[in-house]
Interface confidence: medium
């Protein structure tokens, strides 16, 4: 039937033309919509680590590109910490002494992992190389 009528080719052409692509750059976006759900099931990469590598950040050296945790909870709190001198204080208003140590307030971010990603490589712990 396809050989005689080329119906698949004609239908596909009509679908593609209905998207009104202005240039060749728009076409991959359609492919992304189709392929992304499938690639997500195979592997997910950590965008933060990729950015750190691009920025030549030392922190990224021992981090895996494979994303493990997809759901995290970040909690920002303030804690009291000792400092060697008032020069090390966060600000003069946030500095005090107990007579034997200088103290200041420090912002601390606690990151709690809640749910793992749902892809094949999540539990493989393979090296990136």
């Amino acid at each position: 039937v396809e050989v005689a009528t080329h119906y698949l080719e004609i239908i596909t052409q009509l679908i593609v033309e209905s998207f009104h692509f202005k240039n060749g750059e728009d076409a991959p976006d359609l492919l992304k919509v189709i392929t992304k759900p499938f690639t997500k099931l195979i592997v997910q990469l950590d965008k933060k680590v990729i950015s750190q590598i691009a920025m030549n950040d030392e922190k990224a050296k021992n981090k895996s590109l494979v994303k493990i945790w997809c759901k995290t909870f970040t909690n920002k709190t303030q804690i009291n910490v000792t400092v060697p001198s008032t020069a090390n204080c966060t600000s003069p208003s946030l500095c005090w002494t107990d007579g034997i140590q200088n103290w200041t307030m420090k912002n601390v971010t606690y990151k709690e992992n809640i749910a793992k990603c749902q892809h094949i490589f999540v539990n493989f712990h393979l090296p990136d190389l």
Epitope: T82, P84, S85, T97, D98, G99, I100, Q101
Partner: antibody
Framework: QVQLLESGGGLVQPGGSLRLSCAAS????????MAWVRQAPGKGLEWVSA????????YYADSVKGRFTISRDTSKNTLSLQMSSLRAEDTAIYYC?????????????WGQGTLVTVSS | DIQMTQSPSSLSASVGDRVTIACRAS??????LAWYQQKPGKVPKLLIY???TLQSGVPSRFSGSGSGTDFTLTISSLQPEDVATYYC?????????FGQGTKLEIK
């Protein structure tokens, strides 16, 4: 005049507990940070623990952290050191010491010391 | 932790001599340094605080100097009663550490 009188020392077996006390007089106890400093036989001085004048902040040397607890009772002008899980290396003369009048933990008055011997 | 290193560990000098004991901190401690004297079988006694301030009642032959990491205790004219072990102490930040001591004897 300033007086610091320690008590509670003695012979104890490894793993045992002991409570040292220091009776303070001759100064405003509630205004001074206090500390315990020890000296093993024939050895140098080692700071053990400290407590701020209010009692809100306590400090410990790594060697005693989790085993010793410092506290103060302003109503009785007493400083205490609860020692548990004692080891042979805790054998020393324990001095109660008063903070100097300026900022920081230096010691302008010391007690006569109480000997703690940890041995089986 | 800040390590305090004293030198020499022992020294022998004659009555009337000028004696100096050095103390070095492994990190900058500003001038938050104290010196103590401990005579044999006795309790430590504060000599100097904030590196150079003489404690009330301490003879003027004792003096202290230095700032940052290097400090010195000087006895301008050694007396027989100065026989003792001398300790420096960091009180810039916890843990408050002492030097290992310098034993001073009379020749």
């Amino acid at each position: 005049q300033v007086q610091l009188l320690e008590s509670g020392g003695g012979l104890v077996q490894p793993g045992g507990s002991l409570r040292l006390s220091c009776a303070a007089s001759g100064f405003t106890f509630s205004s001074s940070a206090m500390a315990w400093v020890r000296q093993a036989p024939g050895k140098g001085l080692e700071w053990v623990s400290a407590i701020s004048s209010s009692g809100d902040n306590t400090y410990y040397a790594d060697s005693v952290k989790g085993r010793f607890t410092i506290s103060r009772d302003t109503s009785k002008n007493t400083l205490s050191l609860q020692m548990s899980s004692l080891r042979a290396e805790d054998t020393a003369i324990y001095y109660c010491a008063k903070q100097g009048t300026n900022w920081g933990l230096y010691f302008d008055y010391w007690g006569q010391g109480t000997l703690v011997t940890v041995s089986s | 932790d800040i390590q305090m290193t004293q030198s020499p560990s022992s020294l022998s000098a004659s009555v009337g001599d000028r004696v100096t004991i050095a103390c070095r901190a492994s990190q900058v401690i500003s001038n938050y340094l104290a010196w103590y004297q401990q005579k044999p079988g006795k309790v430590p006694k504060l000599l100097i605080y904030v590196a150079s301030t003489l404690q009330s009642g301490v003879p003027s032959r004792f003096s202290g100097s230095g700032s940052g990491t290097d400090f010195t205790l000087t006895i301008s004219s050694l007396q027989p009663e100065d026989v003792a072990t001398y300790y420096c102490q960091n009180y810039n930040s916890a843990p408050w550490t002492f030097g290992q001591g310098t034993k001073l004897e009379i020749k």
